[in-house]
């Protein structure tokens, strides 16, 4: 069964770049029925969509983060990655990767999630 | 500021029926974009609970239901149980933001 796992360096210093990778196992990232996305959740707060990517490389970003975000995909490694530049304490959050259903019958929802990884931005 | 508004908390006695609202606007739910619901148990990742307004993925019991009308949507839980204590989020697409939006989240407490 398909699983997603986030990985990254842990704490990030203020003004630096946060880099995370999501590895997809038990299936292929190159399916035309799915997008792949990043969502974050600051401690004690709600969910915020960061952006998504298609296996062919097409991206869509949250407008409020667009200037700082890059999402890329490596189908050969079954991975997609997030880079968030110039981070501040407000970027401290649990970061989730997720699969986005895009078929006509599955309605563009986040149907599978990774376990999430806490990224703390320190000064 | 989230594009979808939910009540911060909802509570009910065991066995009771509870409903959570999700209010959007003409640029998201009102445009015809589907609404999806997620359950987030403490310390875990969100799990898809309702997709396409009212459809239950495999493994979700039929005591959970969803609906959409106009610019709002609802999630109902029948026969509230201790294991239903969680945060619930609605989600849709917003044309003015050109992206996915989540609700503010609702904490369900079993009294």
């Amino acid at each position: 069964q398909l699983q997603l796992q986030e990985s990254g360096p842990g704490p990030v210093k203020s003004s630096e770049t946060l880099s995370l990778t999501c590895t997809v196992s038990g299936g292929t990232i190159g399916s035309s029925n799915y997008y792949w996305g990043w969502i974050r959740q600051p401690p004690g707060k709600g969910l915020e969509w960061i952006g998504s990517i298609y296996y062919s490389g097409g991206t869509n970003y949250n407008l409020s983060l667009k200037s700082r975000v890059t999402i890329s995909v490596d189908p050969s490694k079954n991975q997609f990655s997030l880079q968030l530049r110039s981070v501040t304490a407000a970027d401290t959050a649990v970061y989730y990767c997720a699969r986005i259903c895009s078929s006509l019958t599955s309605y563009e929802n986040f149907d599978l999630w990774g376990r999430g990884t806490l990224v703390t931005v320190s000064s | 500021q989230s594009a979808l508004t939910q009540p911060p908390s909802v509570s009910g006695a065991p066995g009771q029926r509870v409903t959570i609202s999700c209010t959007g606007s003409s640029s998201n739910i009102g445009t015809g974009y589907d609404v999806h619901w997620y359950q987030q148990l403490p310390g875990t990742a969100p799990k898809l609970l309702i997709c396409g307004n009212s459809n239950r993925p495999s493994g979700v019991p039929d005591r959970i239901s969803g609906s959409k009308s106009g610019t709002s949507a609802s999630l109902a839980i029948t026969g509230l149980q201790a294991e239903d204590e969680a945060d619930y989020y609605c989600q849709s697409y917003d044309s003015s933001l050109s992206g996915y939006v989540f609700g503010t989240g609702t904490k369900v407490t079993v009294l």
Epitope: - | R17, D62, A76
Partner: antibody, heavy 120, light 108 residues
Framework: QVQLKESGPDLVAPSQSLSITCTVS????????VHWVRQPPGKGLEWLVV???????TNNSPLKSRLSISKDNSKSQVFLKMNSLQTDDTAMYYC??????????????WGQGTSVTVSS | DIQMTQTTSSLSASLGDRVIISCRAS??????LNWYQQKPDGTVKLLIY????LHSGVPSRFSGSGSGTDYSLTINNLSEQEDIATYFC?????????FGGGTKLEIK
């Protein structure tokens, strides 16, 4: 079309167990829950238990220790077992399909019922 | 448990009459109320759900209303064949779901 049919013994001795089967057609047990409701002679309806689409169950608390419900999705059958029967368990036993939306929980289709008499 | 009371256990009416059957809950059930019809042969059918919504295939002569703790089922233009039955209210606000004792409708 949607149909439910109960089958079980007509007569059960006191202190014995009752097993009733509800065989359904026209819908899938993976999508709909099934309730059991009973009606003693000349009396009202009493809700007993429901088995939800995912196999989880909810019981009427006073009867919980005596009731068990299970199902076989592939055979479209739901099973009710009731232990330690007494004469006041004599009743018509119905199974019914659960229909749920955000504003309703109802039993939208019912079987014709099976009559069970507890007597020595 | 929530108690559902149908104070009239039986009532008699003439063909063409308008009949009102009442049901009271022991606490506010927030309109989470259904009505069922049980024919003399034991067949049970859902008539009304969520206080006032007509289930598919049910004649429009049937209607429901109420709020809080007090609810009613109205049958307009009583019809002999179709309407001789016992009518039960049922709450689904809180488990266990409970039924009223029933109101048996007979023709004068």
């Amino acid at each position: 079309q949607v149909q439910l049919k109960e089958s079980g013994p007509d007569l059960v001795a006191p202190s014995q167990s009752l097993s009733i089967t509800c065989t359904v057609s026209g819908f899938s047990l993976t999508s709909y829950g099934v309730h059991w409701v009973r009606q003693p002679p000349g009396k009202g309806l009493e809700w007993l238990v429901v088995i939800w689409s995912d196999g989880s169950t909810t019981n009427n608390s006073p009867l919980k220790s005596r009731l068990s419900i299970s199902k076989d999705n592939s055979k479209s059958q739901v099973f009710l077992k009731m232990n330690s029967l007494q004469t006041d368990d004599t009743a018509m036993y119905y199974c019914a399909r659960h229909w749920g939306t955000t504003v309703v929980d109802a039993m939208d289709y019912w079987g014709q019922g099976t009559s069970v008499t507890v007597s020595s | 448990d929530i108690q559902m009371t149908q104070t009239t256990s039986s009532l008699s009416a003439s063909l063409g009459d308008r009949v009102i059957i009442s049901c009271r809950a022991s606490q506010d059930i927030r309109n989470y109320l259904n009505w069922y019809q049980q024919k003399p042969d034991g067949t049970v059918k859902l008539l009304i759900y969520y206080t006032s919504q007509l289930h598919s295939g049910v004649p429009s002569r049937f209607s429901g209303s109420g709020s809080g703790t007090d609810y009613s089922l109205t049958i307009n233009n009583l019809s002999e064949q179709e309407d001789i039955a016992t009518y039960f209210c049922q709450q689904y606000d809180t488990l266990p779901w409970t039924f009223g004792g029933g109101t048996k409708l007979e023709i004068k």
